[in-house]
Interface confidence: low
């Protein structure tokens, strides 16, 4: 048997909100479950659909979901069918509607002292409670000769008089929520003695020193009073005008004229009509002074031929809002075509070179006119005046590669060397016309160069190969003065390069030939055993066919290299005693001795009374102090070489002998006894 485990139950529901009717069955076989609404099958929609065997409502609809729902379970095999209990929704809703005139039949029939009934067309379930309003103020029962039933949707005014005139609206609420009238009713019951508006003043905008006119008229029986007020409630009459409204005139028909308007005249003007009965009728209008600000500057624009471009003109702030138009060559642009104005924009469709020039955006209102120019350039692809050419540049001299192009705007030129961008430095310079200057050409400048000339419209490029014509030169140039150690083997190298490999030979400066123990081996001068006679001036000559010859002069000195006869030793001295650091060197030419103490050269002329350097090179320091401690370096040098040796100097306090030590105890370190 088919058993309902969960049956749908009648329930409260809210219009437009979710709901669920549950249905669950248990059966021995496969059961097919569907739903009926008032006996008709329920079709699934996005709003109402089966969910499992339950019926789900995404948004309850008071019209489509009213009725009786029933869950039906059917065993398709046995044909057995079971139906659930009926379930329905108590749908809570509220719907706004207008306020309408129920009595009399038409507005034309409304007369003073007649009964007027208004009906509030807000419906809902449960039945709503109503509240009426006149001009936004709630009305309560029995208020000012009207009968209002808050439970009813009707408002009865009996009798209706001019004091009941106003905008009537209603609101209603129930368990679902609240709604207010979608359209309100204006009740107008004329009272001849009430002031009625015939002509209301309008806001005006005027230029400085111009005139402004406000019109204002009321009607009533007897005729009403009319009065003008400005801003601070100051009355304006032809007899008494406030100081800042000396040029104001009130005409018999109620119009107010202001002449030669000034900024202080701007503001709110109130026209007040007062009838014999009824409240005063206040009408307001504002006088604005026209104004216009300056326009922002345009940046020059560069466009490419064939493209579509737009230039927006931001209108200046102004009152009234300024009108904007574009001009070119003194002619206002049309609103269609290839070059035209659209709104505040200048539109150039399919730009041509002839479109280049100055375009002007104009803005104007009552306060005046402003204009701003924009310069439009139509870019062209560069063309060649002179391409870079393969060049032979001489080493050591300046070299030039040309890249001369023309275009609009003036093209920018960049150069590449071996695909690397050349940045200007001390050796490379790009002139304004695109020419590249290489200052002091070097051998490795021989490579590929490429120039690229560009504008926004496109670019062109060309490349050239540079061959460097190498100059005849010594590589490296021989040192002009060199020393050779007496009685030792020595070599003096000389090498050179040029466009062709040069030949190199040595000769003595006096023209005499080289001794047999001296050989010239491919530019290297070789001394097997240096003698005193080998000293002198020598010349290295490098030559080739196309470039001739070059010479380098070298003065060779024969010397006995420096050796130390006496070197300074590690020395410890008592504070206040004298330190002696000995140093003696020998060599030819005779070496000079210099001392360096604590990382600075000791200048013999600035040593002061405590220090002295002897002829033999020894350094003596009298009355030593702890700050004299440190490393001392003896430097021996002559025109051929230099040598140095160093030793530390320690300055210590003299120890006080203890009782256990006899007077003959040796000092704990090697001392100089002075």
């Amino acid at each position: 048997a088919i058993v309902f485990i969960k049956q749908p139950s009648s329930q409260d529901a809210l219009q437009g909100r979710r709901a669920l009717l549950r249905c669950e069955v248990e059966a021995p076989g496969l059961v097919h479950v569907y739903w009926l609404l008032d006996g008709a099958p329920v079709q699934d929609t996005e709003r109402r659909f089966t969910q499992g065997s339950s019926l789900s409502f995404a948004a309850v609809d008071r019209l489509q979901d009213s009725g009786t729902f029933q869950c039906v379970a059917r065993d398709d095999v046995t044909g057995e069918e079971a139906r659930s209990a009926n379930a329905s929704f108590n749908i809570k809703w509220i719907e706004a509607g207008p306020v309408v005139l129920k009595h009399p039949a038409s507005e034309a029939e409304i007369q003073p002292q007649t009964q007027v009934t208004l009906r509030c067309h807000i419906d809902g379930h449960p039945r709503p409670t109503y509240q009426w309003f006149r001009d936004g103020t709630p009305l309560s029962d029995g208020q000012s000769n009207n009968t209002v039933s808050s439970k009813e949707r009707n408002l009865t005014l009996r009798p209706a008089g001019p004091e009941h005139s106003g905008l009537y609206s209603c609101c209603a609420h129930n368990a679902f929520g609240q709604a207010c009238s979608s359209q309100n009713f204006t009740l107008s019951i004329a009272d001849e003695s009430f002031a009625r508006v015939v002509l209301a003043p309008q806001d005006v905008i005027v230029a400085r020193n111009e005139e402004a006119m406000f019109h204002c008229q009321f009607s009533a029986q007897p005729p009403p009073n009319l009065q003008w007020l400005f801003e601070d409630e100051t009355p304006i009459t032809n007899r008494s005008r406030p100081p800042h409204l000396r040029r104001a005139t009130v005409f018999a028909n109620g119009s107010l004229l202001l002449t030669q308007v000034r900024p202080r005249n701007a503001g709110v003007y109130r026209c007040i009509g007062q009838g014999q009965r009824g409240p005063p009728v206040i009408l307001e209008a504002t006088l604005h002074l026209a104004e216009i600000e300056d326009m922002p500057l345009f940046e020059p624009r560069v466009f490419t031929a064939g493209s579509e471009e737009r230039v927006t003109c931001l209108p200046p702030k102004g009152l009234p809002e300024p009108s904007v138009w574009w001009e070119h060559a003194g002619v206002r642009l049309p609103t269609h075509g290839r070059v035209y104005q659209k709104g505040h924009e200048l539109v150039l469709a399919s730009i041509a070179e002839s479109d280049a020039g100055v375009y002007t955006c104009h803005a104007a209102n009552l306060a005046g006119q402003r204009r701003q120019d924009v310069n439009i350039t139509v870019a062209t692809v560069p063309t060649w005046l002179k391409k870079p050419q393969d060049s032979q540049l001489e080493e050591g001299k300046p070299g030039y590669l040309h890249c001369l192009t023309q275009a609009t705007p003036k093209p920018t030129v960049v150069w590449y060397r071996n695909q690397m961008l050349i940045s200007e430095d001390s050796r490379f310079e790009v002139f304004k016309n695109g020419t590249l200057r290489i200052n002091n050409v070097e051998v490795y400048d021989g490579t590929w160069y490429r120039c690229v000339s560009s504008t926004p419209a496109g670019s062109i490029e060309a490349q050239a190969r540079v061959q460097v014509l190498e100059k005849l030169k010594f590589t490296p140039p021989p040192q002009p003065q060199q020393c050779m150690e007496f009685d030792k083997e020595a070599t003096v190298p000389c090498s050179a390069t040029g466009r062709e490999k040069p030949t190199i030979k040595w000769e003595r400066a006096d023209g005499s030939s080289l001794p047999e123990w001296v050989t010239d081996n491919a530019g290297t001068l070789h001394f097997a055993r240096v003698t005193r006679d080998d000293a002198g001036n020598y010349t290295c000559i490098a030559s080739n066919g196309p470039q001739g010859q070059i010479r380098a002069h070298v003065q060779l000195t024969v010397a006995v290299f420096i050796t130390f006869k006496v070197e300074p030793e590690r020395t410890t001295v008592y504070q206040g005693h004298t330190a002696l650091l000995q140093c003696e060197a020998q060599g030819d030419p005779k070496p000079l001795i210099q001392w360096k103490g604590k990382d600075r050269i000791l200048d013999p002329t600035k040593l002061g009374p405590r220090m002295h350097i002897f002829q033999n090179g020894s350094l003596v320091i009298h009355d030593v102090a702890p700050e004299d401690s440190g490393r001392y370096t003896c430097i021996a040098g002559n025109s051929c070489n230099i040598k140095h040796t160093e030793a530390p100097l320690y300055v210590v306090d003299k120890p006080v002998p203890e009782e256990s030590e006899g007077p003959g105890s040796p000092p704990p370190y090697k001392m100089i006894q002075t």
């Epitope: 329930q11 669920l20 499992g52």
Partner: antibody
Framework: EVQLVESGGGLVQPGGSLKLSCAAS????????MHWVRQASGKGLEWIGR??????????SYDASVKGRFTISRNDSKNTAYLQMNSLKTEDTAVYYC????????????????WGQGTLVTVSS | DIQMTQSPSSLSASVGDRVTITCQAS??????LNWYQQKPGKAPKVLIY???NLEKGVPSRFSGSGSGTDFTFTISSLQPEDIGTYYC?????????FGGGTKVEIK
């Protein structure tokens, strides 16, 4: 008679793992979504996650507090749901219940009318 | 996540008293709310489903109402066997969330 029986609880150290089982009988397990709910001592109920039926691709969903650490699975041939708990923390100490709607695999319309007796998991060093 | 705020957290009333528990959702959940009763050492048991429907076999003194965000659970006449903790639970959206619970005691 419908029955849900949890097992596998016990004492585990922080950072450790534990796997709970939930054996079901007395209803169509394969068509039902299975949920896990826990309750720390003296505290309220906290939903951990659920696994839907095979017809709903065994889709799983977890509470943010356990996502990435806990995994729910099922074996319809054994009528059993599982809760694999890794990287356990002391705040995971609680009684763990498996629960089911019983008749529908549709979880959003679920209320839990079948509950197990619960199994205690203690995470402590 | 939808937060469920249940109050009071505990109450003490006499037998026969009317007891009211409220539950507030942090966003609109329509009527997708259930109420459970849990006795010490036992698993929870559903009393009310879909905010206002009484589960089969549950005494009629238990009732529920509300829709949207504000819900009320009422025991019209408290009985000694009603002691325990009551929880609301939303299932409008995952993760499913429970209220903090209300412990009901007899004076």
């Amino acid at each position: 008679e419908v029955q849900l029986v949890e097992s596998g609880g016990g004492l585990v150290q922080p950072g450790g793992s534990l796997k709970l089982s939930c054996a079901a009988s007395g209803f169509t397990f394969s068509g039902s979504a299975m949920h896990w709910v826990r309750q720390a001592s003296g505290k309220g109920l906290e939903w951990i996650g659920r696994i839907r039926s095979k017809a709903n691709n065994d889709a799983t969903s977890y509470d943010a507090s356990v996502k990435g650490r806990f995994t729910i699975s099922r074996n319809d041939s054994k009528n059993t749901a599982y809760l694999q708990m890794n990287s356990l923390k002391t705040e995971d100490t609680a009684v763990y219940y498996c629960t089911s709607r019983g008749y529908s695999g549709y979880d959003y319309s679920s209320y839990f009318d079948y509950w197990g007796q619960g199994t205690l998991v203690t995470v402590s060093s | 996540d939808i937060q469920m705020t249940q109050s009071p957290s505990s109450l003490s009333a006499s037998v026969g008293d009317r007891v009211t528990i409220t539950c507030q959702a942090s966003q609109d959940i329509s009527n997708y709310l259930n109420w459970y009763q849990q006795k010490p050492g036992k698993a929870p048991k559903v009393l009310i489903y879909d905010a206002s429907n009484l589960e089969k076999g549950v005494p009629s003194r238990f009732s529920g109402s509300g829709s949207g965000t504000d819900f009320t659970f009422t025991i019209s006449s408290l009985q000694p066997e009603d002691i325990g903790t009551y929880y609301c639970q939303q299932y409008d959206n995952l993760p499913i969330t429970f209220g903090g619970g209300t412990k009901v005691e007899i004076k």
